[in-house]
């Protein structure tokens, strides 16, 4: 009634190990770490067999098969490479996830290395079984922005890709009779969000009520260089239009807004987001130089009043840009207080420009980002948004351009972009 001696499977063992097995003795077959018992095409951790009355074993000894984690999951905006030869996906094999550089980077700066674990899952030391997240790289244009730049007055043509965050916002308010059409600029913050000035998205009413335009009336163009040729640009409709709840038409305080795009836009050399500043009330320091781009008035011979009266919105065909220094709050406040008209430069604004004039933002540039290079992070940061200017012509002497101080609104922006009301799409890195 003895059963034949058992040979343990390769990469496995038998317990208990005895010299002799008699009727009713049982053995448990198990495999080494990283291997599983394979029996009749079924995979299990252990397998039990018994010595029968007739001296035969109840089953054949199963084999031990190496654990296979299978093909790794794809990564949005990323790719996976195999570190092991022959693209092995078995126990202890390694893969590496990476993001589509230079447009995306890995959140938390993890290595992206995953190992096939004994449990059959791809595992990372930090993220465990979770996949990494590829976030858009902000404020790093594929073309380096020029160091020296001489409406937008006194500016110059931007080359394609210099301001990849620049958005053209076109509003065609078909609810008006007759239809009303205007445009402004904005800045891409992520694949789905555009930052702009509230006054760009306020319905151009005959009273001073602040009502946002309907989302159906908003079109956003990204990767645009020349407005006469939109073929290479990405155009998107709006899913939501969000004006700052405290935007004041009388003094343009809180002149900031967001547009959530209907669909996330693909990032590339000509479409990349700008970074948001750290939330701090100081804003950019006086004399710091910033760049601002736009398709607004660039003809110094056309007056703003002529444009307003004619009802046309003369704009530059090719994106223009200018470099301007930040002006101290005290100097700016004083320059506006000396003017007739009720001008208040609040703590939510800062000014930029030259005392002698000649370089400025102008009608049609509204909502565009005033960007400053952050030496610490080596990124361009949206410190301001083109908001308003004095009663004189753009680029006039001692009339500084006024910009929304974005750093005062960072918390509000994150709140809105991550609110349950937002059409759910993607994560945005703080």
């Amino acid at each position: 009634n003895e059963c034949p001696k058992l040979q343990p499977p390769v990469y496995g063992k038998i317990e208990p190990s005895q010299a002799v097995y008699s009727f009713k003795d049982q053995v448990l077959v198990s495999c080494d770490t990283g291997y599983k018992v394979l029996k009749d095409n079924g995979v299990m951790d252990t397998f039990q067999i018994e010595c029968l009355k007739d001296g035969a074993w109840s089953n054949k000894i199963p084999t031990c098969k190496i654990v296979d984690c299978g093909a790794p999951a794809g990564l949005k905006h990323g790719l996976v490479t195999f570190s092991t030869r022959n693209n092995l996906t078995t126990y202890k094999s390694e893969i590496r996830y990476s993001c589509q550089q230079p447009y995306y980077k890995m959140l938390h700066n993890t290595t992206g290395v995953y190992t096939c674990s004994a449990h059959g899952t791809w595992t990372n030391e930090v993220l465990k079984r979770s996949l990494p997240t590829c976030l858009p790289v902000c404020g790093q244009p594929s073309r380096a922005l020029p160091n020296l730049v001489k409406r937008i007055i006194g500016g110059r043509n931007a080359e394609l890709g210099l301001f990849p965050w620049q958005a053209l916002i076109v509003v065609e308010d078909t609810s008006r009779v007759p239809n009303d059409k205007w445009f402004g600029s904005g800045a891409l913050l992520s694949e789905s969000w555009i930052l702009t000035a509230a006054h760009v998205l306020r319905s151009q009413r005959r009273d001073n009520t602040v009502i946002p335009v309907s989302k159906e009336h908003v079109t956003v163009y990204l990767g645009l260089h020349d407005v006469r040729d939109k073929s290479g640009a990405v155009n998107s409709s709006a899913a939501r239009v969000i004006l700052h709840p405290d935007f004041n038409i009388q003094n343009y305080n809180h002149d900031i807004a967001l547009v959530q795009l209907q669909k996330p836009v693909p990032l590339g050399a000509h479409v990349m987001p700008i970074c948001l500043p750290r939330p701090e009330p100081e804003g950019p320091a006086p004399h710091m130089l910033g760049l601002v781009a736009g398709w607004g008035i660039s003809n110094p011979n056309v007056t703003v009043d002529e444009i307003i009266l004619s009802g046309t919105r003369t704009l530059s065909d090719v994106l223009q840009y200018v470099k301007l220094p930040v002006v101290s709050h005290a100097e700016c406040k004083a320059s506006y207080e000396s003017r007739s008209g009720n001008y208040s430069v609040t703590e939510n604004m800062f000014c930029a420009g030259y005392y002698e004039g000649g370089k400025d933002t102008c009608l049609g540039d509204s909502g565009g980002a005033f960007v400053i290079f952050d030496e610490m992070s080596q990124h361009w940061v949206a410190q301001g948004l083109v908001s308003w200017g004095g009663p004189e012509e753009c680029g006039s002497k001692q009339v500084y351009g006024v910009y929304t101080k974005v750093s005062n609104y960072v918390d509000w922006l994150w709140e809105e972009m991550n609110s349950p009301r937002a059409v759910r799409d993607l994560q945005v890195e703080r």
Partner: antibody, heavy 114, light 112 residues
Framework: QVQLKQSGPELVKPGASVKLSCKAS????????INWVKQRPGQGLEWIGW????????KYNEKFTDKATLTVDVSSSTAFMELHRLTSEDSAVYFC???????WGQGTLVTVSS | DIVMTQSPSSLAVSAGEKVTMSCKSS????????????LSWYQQKPGQSPKLLIY???TRESGVPDRFTGSGSGTDFTLTISSVQAEDLAVYYC????????FGGGTKLEIK
């Protein structure tokens, strides 16, 4: 074409309420506020308030806060104004207007008399 | 509250004459940021609804004859009819939309 059609004349008793209607057609109803204006016989125009159909936001002339209630029914593109606790002072023609006063209704005459 | 004062309260002119009427507000109606004065002019003919003529102080509503011109800024505004026609017999109202809305008392235009 754009039209604002107001309900017919009303003869009401003092202390009662009356609900006037203004049916809009020919434009985007939800994107344009509806204004209501009062005109007493032989007198000038007095703004009562407005309602924005997209979200129901209302703004009132302080004088009419307790007198008038503005509502809309988006499904029928109709705006309503209910006047409460009527007195002879409320006898007037009431106009609705929209698309920022580009279009006006023909007016509804309300007469308060016992 | 913003008070709107119109003058004169009535005037009579012959057809073909030029007429001006004034509207003053108790505070400025100019919003510097938008470079707009939030003032409108209306015409109300006998037994009819008011009709918008001018908005933003000087922008003519579509379909309004060019003999009607609005001017002024801040607190002082004027409506000018360059050559009065018989059909211009009406009451003319100004209205501020700087802070909610307030109408002026009206100017009654009669034809001699």
């Amino acid at each position: 074409q754009v039209q604002l059609k107001q309900s017919g004349p009303e003869l009401v008793k003092p202390g009662a309420s009356v609900k006037l209607s203004c049916k809009a057609s020919g434009y985007t109803f939800t994107s344009n506020d509806i204004n209501w204006v009062k005109q007493r016989p032989g007198q000038g125009l007095e703004w009562i308030g407005w309602i924005y159909p997209r979200d129901g936001t209302t703004k009132y002339n302080e004088k009419f806060t307790d007198k008038a209630t503005l509502t809309v029914d988006v499904s029928s593109s109709t705006a309503f104004m209910e006047l409460h606790r009527l007195t002879s002072e409320d006898s007037a023609v009431y106009f609705c207007s929209s698309v920022e006063d580009s279009y006006w209704g023909q007016g509804t005459l309300v007469t308060v008399s016992s | 509250d913003i008070v709107m004062t119109q003058s004169p309260s009535s005037l009579a002119v012959s057809a073909g004459e030029k007429v001006t009427m004034s509207c003053k507000s108790s505070q400025s109606l100019l919003i510097s940021r938008t470079r707009k004065n939030y003032l409108s002019w209306y015409q109300q003919k006998p037994g009819q609804s008011p009709k918008l003529l001018i908005y933003w102080a000087s922008t003519r509503e579509s379909g309004v004859p060019d003999r009607f011109t609005g001017s002024g800024s801040g607190t002082d505004f004027t409506l000018t009819i360059s050559s009065v026609q018989a059909e211009d017999l009406a009451v003319y109202y100004c209205k501020q939309s700087y802070n909610l809305y307030t109408f002026g008392g009206g100017t009654k235009l009669e034809i001699k």
